[in-house]
């Protein structure tokens, strides 16, 4: 019943947190910035990893897309893609994740089987979560070294004066978002691979037994080793040579003509 | 490269009106705030009127009702309707904008047009 709900809470927490990490990608607000030197109004500029926006006190918002490739930044491609690779993660490892889920039945499919997903599940929703963590602390890093406060640089260019404009940049929201995001698919990948270790399925109880005859009349019978699988003659899973199994944790004798395992 | 050219400037009589105009060209990524300042000799520079991307504008107290400024944002130029012109308008006019290039969206900046000359004399 614990592992159930381990599996089920892993798997909420890390749809939220890969909900959270869509929202983030496509949100505006990476960067905000005040237009400090605006003479007509006061101006606000947000922007994220695929457009600009430019917001007025009176409302008016413009936004403009990065429709090209050349002028972006090397981060801001390397954050693109660590996002991107962090959804796509994210969503098999939710697909994978409800085929794993115990509470759901398909056909015939074993424990081991549903283990191996649920392990699967939880190392993409790692992966997962630290690509959006690693994408948004690369920008936030990027804002920080490059752009905290652009300085009052002047030069003269071909159409006369030019020189950069004095801006304030901060965290935008988005970069909230995703950390928390990026946490909690992290946390759910994380409880997923808790989860599946107990589901792995109990079979590995007797694999490793150690058959002594207790007489020399004693003839070995293939169903029994293979009892605890269900698969042998032995179907109702009792345990044959109770008396002369022991498990290898146990002292052992010397090799004999008796033991057969 | 971006460039602000202005034009429009010249010798005009009192009372006399004047249209200037200022396009930015080059490598574009945003603009914001456009606007025309003015330098008479011996003065500091000051803002005549601004227009921001969204229409809001801001005039200078000795200009106001007299200059009107508008803006065609789709060829990135601004306009400065000057009336009732005065002596004490003599000066070069500079066009400004604050804007982002397509090598740098990250970074606004202030670019100056090397301005046009207005004279208001009998």
């Known amino acids: 019943m614990a592992v159930t709900a381990c599996q089920g809470l892993g798997f909420v927490v890390s749809l939220i947190g890969i909900a959270g990490i869509i929202a983030a990608t496509c949100m505006d607000q990476w960067s905000t910035q005040d237009l400090y030197n605006n003479p007509v109004t006061a101006v606000f500029n947000y922007q994220g990893l695929w457009r600009s926006c430019v917001r007025e006190s009176s409302g008016f918002t413009e936004c403009r897309g990065y429709f090209t490739l050349l002028g972006l930044p090397a981060m801001l491609q390397a954050v693109r893609a660590l996002m991107i690779v962090g959804i796509v993660l994210g969503a098999i490892g939710l697909l994978v994740s409800i085929f794993a889920l115990k509470c759901i039945r398909i056909g015939s499919m074993e424990d081991s089987a549903k283990a191996n997903m649920t392990l699967t599940s939880g190392i993409m929703f790692i992966v997962s979560g630290l690509c959006a963590i690693a994408g948004v602390s690369v920008f936030a890093n990027m804002l920080v070294t490059n752009f905290w406060m652009s300085t009052a640089n002047m030069y003269t260019g071909m159409g006369g004066m030019v020189q950069t404009v004095q801006t304030r940049y901060t965290f935008g929201a988005a970069l909230f978002v995703g950390w928390v995001a990026g946490g909690l698919t992290l946390i759910g990948g994380v409880m997923m691979c808790i989860a599946c270790r107990g589901l792995a399925p109990e079979e590995t109880n007797y694999k490793a037994v150690s058959y002594h005859a207790s007489g020399h009349s004693v003839a070995y019978k293939p169903g029994g080793f293979k009892a605890s699988t269900g698969f042998g003659s032995n179907t109702k899973n009792k345990k044959i040579y109770d008396g002369g199994a022991r498990t290898e944790d146990e002292v052992q004798s010397y090799p004999s003509k008796h033991d057969y395992v | 490269q971006v460039q602000l050219v202005e034009s429009g400037g010249g010798l005009v009589q009192p009372g006399g009106s004047l249209r200037l105009s200022c396009a930015a060209s080059?490598?574009?990524?945003?603009?914001?705030?456009m606007g025309w300042y003015r330098q008479a000799p011996g003065k500091q520079r000051e803002l005549v009127a601004a227009i921001t991307t969204g229409g809001s504008t801001k005039y200078s107290d000795s200009v106001k009702g007299r200059f009107t400024i508008s803006r065609d944002n789709a060829k990135n130029t601004v306009y400065l309707q000057m009336n009732s012109l005065k002596p004490e308008d003599t000066a070069v006019y500079y066009c400004?904008?604050?804007?982002?290039?397509?090598?740098?969206?990250?970074?606004?900046?202030?670019?100056w047009g090397q301005g046009t000359q207005v004279t208001v004399s009998s």
């Open positions: 080059g490598s574009i990524f945003q603009i914001n705030t």
């Open positions: 400004n904008a604050d804007l982002k290039t397509n090598s740098n969206v990250f970074t606004w900046y202030e670019y």
